[in-house]
């Protein structure tokens, strides 16, 4: 499966939208920094078959969609930017789902690495727990926004490696 060039562009647009979403100066939020334990090894892409890598990327984007679709998120971010954000995430999910369907029967290995999917879910559970503990404060959301931008940048590296693997 070829991940379309539009997918990379959508990823870049997603990062640009997230960069615009800030509502307060992050400089006031230094003390709220937190170690969410980003599962770097799941995005290194070395130990994966292609289909498994795609499923991990899909899970990350799905979890991001879920995180920013909550009532608390809607109350925090600009509605217009959120709508653009959802559109880009939806586009990426569709691209990855189409790719996963094409990979069916291509590889002998399972389409999904369950352990990796669970690792990504636990990462997002830690983010949600942090937001809850911080009572969804503006600074907590700023820290989460920075973390998601970083994770998207790192996942973009995996996507590029997948593109080069064709």
């Amino acid at each position: 499966c070829d991940l379309p060039q539009t997918h990379s562009l959508s990823n870049r647009r997603t990062l640009m939208i997230m960069a615009q979403m800030g509502r307060i100066s992050p400089f006031s939020c230094l003390k709220d920094r937190h170690d969410f334990g980003f599962p770097q090894e799941e995005f290194d892409g070395n130990q994966f078959q292609k289909a498994q890598a795609i499923s991990v990327l899909h899970e990350m984007i799905q979890q991001t969609f879920n995180l920013f679709s909550t009532k608390d998120s809607s109350a925090t971010w600009d509605e217009t930017l959120l709508d653009k954000f959802y559109t880009e995430l939806y586009q990426q999910l569709n691209d990855l789902e189409a790719c996963m369907m094409q990979e069916v029967g291509v590889e002998d290995t399972p389409l999904m690495n369950v352990d990796s999917i669970l690792t990504v879910r636990k990462y997002f559970q830690r983010i949600t727990l942090y937001l809850t503990e911080k009572k969804y404060s503006p600074c907590a959301w700023e820290v989460v926004r920075a973390e998601i931008m970083r994770s998207f940048s790192l996942s973009a590296n995996l996507q590029e490696r997948l593109r080069r693997k064709e």
Epitope: A19, G22, S25, P26, F27, C29, L30, K31, D32, R33, H34, D35, F36, E142, V143, A146, E147, M149, R150, S153
Partner: antibody, heavy 121, light 107 residues
């Protein structure tokens, strides 16, 4: 390879203006903040201020607020430190360093080589 | 502003010695503390971040500990290249502040 390359040494007279630069390469320039640190001859390190190159938001140490201006041009991955009117007491080595912002990552993990500014009549 | 106080301001030691430098913050900073090494004419170099995490590429003889207000940088076995000035820096809040430095000299 991550690098921060600063502009060369400067010799200026009191009252003159100056703008020194710090060019980042080998990483996404807008994903990190750039901080500036002063070191006067034979003295310790003093944090001056910081900029987020993605939107040019700045924060200054109260000691340097109004004394210097920090700016950035993300199109050329460069941050700047400038003075409108130098004083002899501005004589120092100035370093830029990158900061991970709100991410849980090492602070000031890469530094420029330093720019020596000498102000003398 | 958060004040950072290092001790001692200088010390003399021999190669192979165990060296300990302390840093005290004027208020609790959790584990938001970094340690840097600076050699004459060179830019500072990050050694330890978040109080105890060893920066990539830094020898394991360097270690950091502490949290709250009291922190320690330890060099388990001093090497010739370790003679330098060491600075702590609080990373909790702006303005970021450094300790005054500890110069490690050859005995």
């Amino acid at each position: 390879e991550v690098q921060l390359v600063q502009s060369g040494a400067e010799v200026k007279k009191p009252g003159e203006s100056l703008k020194i630069s710090c060019k980042g390469s080998g990483y996404s320039f807008t994903s990190y903040w750039i901080g500036w640190v002063r070191q006067m001859p034979g003295k310790g390190l003093e944090w001056m201020g910081i900029i987020d190159p993605s939107d040019s938001d700045t924060a200054y140490s109260p000691s340097f607020q109004g004394q210097v201006t920090i700016s950035a041009d993300k199109s050329i991955s460069t941050a700047y430190l400038q003075w409108s009117s130098l004083k002899a007491s501005d004589t120092a080595m100035y370093y830029c360093a990158r900061h991970p912002g709100l991410n849980w990552a090492p602070d000031f993990d890469y530094w420029g080589q330093g720019t020596l500014v000498t102000v003398s009549s | 502003d958060i004040q950072m106080t290092q001790s001692p301001s200088s010390l003399s030691a021999s190669v192979g010695d165990r060296v300990t430098i302390t840093c005290r913050a004027s208020q609790s900073i959790g584990d938001f503390l970094n340690w840097y090494q600076q050699k004459p004419g060179k830019a500072p170099k990050l050694l330890i971040y978040f109080a105890s995490s060893l920066q990539s590429g830094v020898p394991s003889r360097f270690s950091g500990s502490g949290s709250g207000t009291d922190f320690t940088l330890t060099i388990s076995s001093l090497q010739p290249e370790d003679f330098a000035t060491y600075y702590c820096q609080q990373a909790l809040d702006f303005p970021l502040t450094f300790g005054q430095g500890t110069k490690v000299e050859i005995k």
